[in-house]
């Protein structure tokens, strides 16, 4: 009796179970009672990443420089090309089909984690004792200047956006 289901890595056609083509190969002709499934390797710049019965391989993704994309990993007959973003940009999605510039941390915030090709800058508020007076994609919060170590005194308190202002100690006695 003809099968109604086939084993893994097989497919049903004309009441017969045929072997699927392995990753990196496409289907040329189905098996018959007397012949095996005929498969052919994908050509350069094409791929198939699963056991399949596709008659055409897929084209590798094009990492379009117009969009700020570049090749992170060249595709093979079994894998697609992996794109990433140029320096200063990061992907807008996991599939990395477009890029946006890295976010800068505003004054009062410092960089907690520098951006990569796939993730944006992570900013954090400068805690007490630290400040950032610039908008930057790479600068961390900096500690306030220690006036005491310079034998000076604080003339103006620091904020999350400004450093303390040090000045000479008042030597006049009452």
């Amino acid at each position: 009796e003809p099968p109604t289901a086939c084993r893994e890595k097989q497919y049903l056609i004309n009441s017969q179970c045929c072997s699927l083509c392995q990753p990196g190969q496409k289907l040329v002709s189905d098996c018959t009672e007397f012949t095996e499934t005929e498969c052919l390797p994908c050509s350069e710049s094409e791929f198939l990443d699963t056991w399949n019965r596709e008659t055409r391989c897929h084209q590798h993704k094009y990492c379009d420089p117009n969009l700020g994309l570049q090749v992170q990993q060249k595709g093979t007959s079994e894998t697609d090309t992996i794109c990433t973003c140029e320096e200063g940009l990061h992907c807008t999605s996991e599939s990395c089909e477009s890029c946006v510039p890295h976010r800068s941390c505003l004054p009062g915030f410092g960089v907690k984690q520098i951006a990569t090709g796939v993730s944006d800058t992570i900013c954090e508020p400068c805690p007490v004792g630290f400040f950032s007076n610039v908008s930057s994609a790479f600068e961390k919060c900096r500690p306030w200047t220690s006036c005491e170590t310079k034998d000076l005194v604080v003339q103006q308190a620091g904020t999350n956006k400004t450093d303390v202002v040090c000045g000479p100690q008042d030597r006049q006695r009452a």
Partner: antibody, heavy 129, light 112 residues
Framework: QVQLVESGGGVVQPGRSLRLSCAAS????????MHWVRQAPGKGLEWVAV????????YHADSVWGRFTISRDNSRSTLYLQMNSLRAEDTAVYYC??????????????????????WGQGTTVTVSS | DIVMTQSPLSLPVTPGEPASISCRSS???????????LDWYLQKPGQSPQLLIY???NRASGVPDRFSGSGSGTDFTLKISRVEAEDVGVYYC?????????FGQGTKVEIK
């Protein structure tokens, strides 16, 4: 001066193959992405294929995919289009074109795209029995 | 694929008069960096195409300032402030946002 010169066109029978070449001069070929664009007699422009500056990344129009292959030899400053299983509808003038760009520094390509800024004179391919 | 539609397909012009060509895309060509990835090309009779405008509104090197490009998103316009006899030919818009690149059908500009 900056120049692109196509060659390799001719009359060929359906099902046969042809290889077009595009010789570049006057600029650093290996720094530029390159395109093939074609124009059937009396028709508009049709984009065919693109290849990255290093040749690692390429893409073909659906109408030619699986039959045509774009490639390049940077040591010879030459772009190629290998055309197999030719059809009557592939009859056209084939142009190579350079993807213009500006700064090669950080974010250069992203912020400085200059269109297809240099085109060859074209080479004619006629597919006929 | 992005479909590019030009109008008019034929444009008879008088030298010295202005001319305008429209190009519409099936999806927005405005990218995250604020640029519109649309180019304009001119193919003069018997010649190869030549770049006129890139990124929607930037004139290519050597292009006379009577040519200007405008628009954003899906609607773009190429204007010639005062047409000259040498401006005859077929004008094409092309989107550069997606692979495959796609061209408009072309607008044939001829002297009346």
């Amino acid at each position: 001066q900056v120049q692109l010169v196509e060659s390799g066109g001719g009359v060929v029978q359906p099902g046969r193959s042809l290889r077009l070449s595009c010789a570049a001069s006057g600029f650093t070929f290996s720094s530029y992405g390159m395109h093939w664009v074609r124009q059937a007699p009396g028709k508009g422009l049709e984009w065919v294929a693109v290849i990255s500056n290093d040749g690692d990344n390429k893409y073909h129009a659906d109408s030619v995919w699986g039959r045509f292959t774009i490639s390049r030899d940077n040591s010879r400053s030459t772009l190629y289009l290998q055309m197999n299983s030719l059809r009557a509808e592939d009859t056209a003038v084939y142009y190579c074109a350079r993807r213009g760009m500006g700064s090669s520094g950080s974010r250069g390509d992203y912020y400085y795209y200059y269109g297809l800024d240099v085109w060859g004179q074209g080479t004619t391919v006629t597919v006929s029995s | 694929d992005i479909v590019m539609t030009q109008s008019p397909l034929s444009l008879p012009v008088t030298p010295g008069e202005p001319a305008s060509i429209s190009c519409r895309s099936s999806q927005s060509l405005l990218y995250s960096n604020g640029y519109n990835f649309l180019d304009w090309y001119l193919q003069k009779p018997g010649q190869s195409p030549q770049l006129l405008i890139y990124l929607g509104s930037n004139r290519a090197s050597g292009v006379p300032d009577r040519f200007s490009g405008s628009g954003s998103g899906t609607d773009f316009t190429l204007k010639i402030s005062r047409v000259e006899a040498e401006d005859v030919g077929v004008y094409y818009c092309m989107q550069a946002l997606q692979t495959p690149r796609t061209f408009g059908q072309g607008t044939k500009v001829e002297i009346k």
